[in-house]
């Protein structure tokens, strides 16, 4: 008799990334019988949810659902039938929602609750939505690229570091050299695979690259003479209105907010890198440090460790701009932002038609960000950058705190080694 | 402003095929999803399938699968609906169209092309 | 298939007034918790327009004038005050399931 292939077996999980500027949902498969191995998990789908991040609802929470089928039903059609009820299905908030935490409770709420309702509507194994913390989101990105990199399971090898940004914050994650960790909020230990980790990680609340623009503006326009603002950070030629309104809507710039003599105002670009870079730097505070050292707005960052990942718009960003190559030192990326944020706006719309107007003209900004961000804010140098290595995907799987996440809430990252290898069950009988 | 702009009319003879495209601009064609729609003469709306550019996945109302291919090319932003074997039952106004959120705000909208015509004769 | 059907097949209704357009699925259209009924109107020579989306939200810059209702199988599209601008054939969709299908039309006449 001919030899008959048994059923996979295998199982699913659902995370749903529900970040500042839009929604993306990630389906992860494994085999059942290799639960606790290092690296078995792999992602097969994502679908980017087509609309903003949830937390632009607010107003229209009783449409949430409408919003979220897309991708469930993209998530029924890939998993099959037979296990819809027993994968998991989670949904994390990162920034954007605890910004909006911070202005209303209450309104926070109301989405999460709309969102948990519409979840369970589904045929699976709805967990649960919740915003998580800044701490468990570089926490869990940290564990995700290592994990997928298979730093876990490689005797005394070294981990890398996580640098993640997104629309609201950005966080940043690493073993320190054998140094102690000043700031408690700061530590976290791990205990993976039967190895102890001594984990540094910070998430920066309003500077993610589309809170930090708003911060940038708010803080430009105060000083401004008329309803005209000239911005080194948009090309020449650039010019956009902004609503008063709109740039106070956004607790990151409560700080800068004043009552001003208009309540519109026209950017006028100017593209200019080196004014840009200086504009951006009066974001950090680096006047004041209670400890041995520090990021910014007094915030401690032990002295910078080994190999980094940076992914997220980290990523998306430098990877538009063609600088991801670990080739490109930082002196030239900074001569390549240079010529680029120089390059008239006319120009720009032509070479890259299909994008997004919006987002094109925000390009300059958010390179030059990364830059100061890296440089300035996290100390890494001309000679430490090659350190950084700017990654979309790791195998397949997209850089991110998702898979972290759903490996921690499904009990897959043991905290010791196991003692053996499951015998894999063989493909044919 | 997001736009549609089809290519123009099209006489094809039957046993032919064609290729309609749907040039995007205003917004990234893989934040949303694009929808082809047939149109007879006098007739009503008939819908083709949906393309999903981001990832190239589709859905077809079946009696269109083997008569439309449905593709879409990110890097110059359009979207293409191929149709072989032609007859005159395939003569029609074809639109590509997009309906859903914007991608900043929680607005609802949607965008047509114009149309393009296609005859099929002899 | 969902087969959907629109009565009248044609109306005419004085300006100011209550225009009242029905569609009836042969099945639910409803799923999740939503209601998968969306209506477009077409004039002469354009493409269709959306009106109305999950059967009772309005789409973006659509007048106040349009709203939409129901669940299920029955749904209605009713504008009120009729203006000289909705004249125009009307068209409900469903998207619950592929094939996702059109309702047949209801020519709308200023009488």
């Known amino acids: 008799t001919q030899n008959k292939a048994l059923p996979e077996n295998v199982k699913y999980g659902i995370v749903l990334d529900a970040g500042s500027s839009h929604t993306s949902l990630y389906i992860y498969k494994w085999p059942a019988e290799k639960e606790n191995d290092t690296g078995v998990v792999h992602q097969v789908e994502e679908c980017r949810v087509k609309g903003p991040g949830i937390s632009k609802f607010v107003q229209k929470v009783n449409e949430i659902g409408i919003y979220l089928t897309d991708c469930m039903e993209r998530a029924r059609e890939v998993i099959p039938r037979s296990q819809h009820q027993e994968t998991p299905v989670y949904l994390g908030a990162t920034a954007g929602m605890r910004l909006l935490r911070m202005e209303s409770e209450e309104l926070a709420d109301r989405v999460l609750d709309v969102v948990e309702r519409s979840l369970s509507n589904y045929p699976f194994d709805f967990q649960g939505a919740r915003i998580i913390t800044g701490q468990e989101e570089g926490a869990y990105g940290w564990i995700t690229i290592n994990y997928l990199l298979g730093r876990f399971k490689t005797p005394g090898g070294s981990t890398f570091g996580a640098l993640d940004l997104g629309g609201a914050s950005t966080q940043v994650t690493f073993v320190p050299q054998n140094q102690t960790i000043e700031s408690p909020d700061n530590a976290l230990q791990f205990r993976l695979y039967g190895k102890d980790y001594n984990v540094y990680t910070h998430s920066f609340l309003c500077y993610g690259k589309d809170q930090a623009l708003w911060q940038k503006l708010a803080k430009d326009i105060q000083v401004a003479s008329n309803e005209i603002l000239r911005d080194p950070c948009f090309h020449p030629g650039y010019k956009k209105v902004v609503n008063v309104s709109d740039l106070y809507k956004t607790p990151c710039t409560k700080r800068f907010e004043m009552t001003l003599p208009f309540q519109q105002f026209e950017i006028q670009g100017i593209g200019n890198y080196q004014q840009c870079h200086q504009s951006i730097l009066e974001l950090f505070n680096t006047s004041y440090c209670p400890y041995s050292q520090c990021a910014f707005n007094g915030i401690f960052l032990p002295p910078l460790q080994g190999d980094f990942g940076a992914f997220s718009a980290f990523y998306f960003v430098m990877k538009f701009l063609n600088l991801t190559s670990e080739k490109v030192s930082q002196e030239k990326v900074t001569e390549m932002m240079k010529k680029f944020c120089a390059q008239p706006w006319e120009e720009i719309k032509t070479s890259y038609a299909g994008v997004k107007e919006k987002y094109l003209s925000e390009y300059c900004f958010s390179g030059t960000y990364i830059l100061s961000l890296l440089l300035q804010g996290y100390h890494f140098t001309a000679d430490s950058w090659e350190h950084i290595h700017f990654i979309g995907k790791i195998q397949g799987s997209d850089a991110g705190w998702t898979l972290g996440y759903m490996l921690n809430l499904t009990n897959m990252i043991p905290a010791e080694q196991p003692l053996s290898t499951p015998l894999s069950h063989s493909t044919y009988v | 402003e997001v736009q549609l702009q089809q290519s123009g009319a099209e006489l094809v003879k039957p046993g032919a095929s064609v290729k309609l495209s749907c040039i995007v601009s205003?917004?990234?064609?893989?934040?949303?999803?694009i929808n082809w729609v047939k149109q007879r003469p006098e007739q009503g709306l008939e819908w083709i399938g949906r393309?999903?550019?981001?990832?190239?996945?589709?859905k077809y109302d079946p009696k269109f699968q083997g008569k439309a291919t449905m593709t879409s090319d990110t890097s110059s932003n359009t979207a293409y609906l191929h149709l072989s074997s032609l007859t005159s039952d395939d003569s029609a106004v074809y639109y590509c169209?997009?309906?859903?959120?914007?991608?900043?705000?929680?607005?609802?909208?949607?965008?047509w092309g114009q149309g393009t015509t296609l005859t099929v004769s002899s | 298939d969902i087969v959907l059907t629109q009565s009248p097949a044609s109306l005419a209704v004085s300006l100011g007034q209550r225009a009242t357009i029905s569609c009836r699925a042969s099945?639910?259209?409803?799923?999740?918790?939503?209601?998968?009924m969306n209506w477009f109107q077409q004039k002469p020579g354009q493409p269709p327009k959306l009106l109305i989306y999950?059967?009772?939200n309005q789409g973006s810059g659509v007048p106040a004038r349009f709203s939409g209702s129901g669940s299920g199988t029955d749904f209605s599209l009713n504008i009120l005050p009729m203006e000289e601008v909705d004249a125009a054939m009307y068209f409900c969709?469903?998207?619950?399931?592929?094939?996702?299908?059109f309702g047949g039309g209801t020519k709308l006449e200023i009488k």
């Open positions: 169209a997009r309906w859903g959120y914007d991608d900043e705000e929680a607005d609802y909208f949607d965008s």
């Open positions: 205003g917004f990234n064609i893989k934040d949303t999803y």
């Open positions: 393309i999903d550019p981001a990832n190239g996945n589709t």
């Open positions: 099945e639910s259209v409803d799923n999740y918790g939503i209601s998968f």
């Open positions: 999950a059967a009772s």
């Open positions: 969709h469903q998207s619950k399931e592929v094939p996702w299908t």
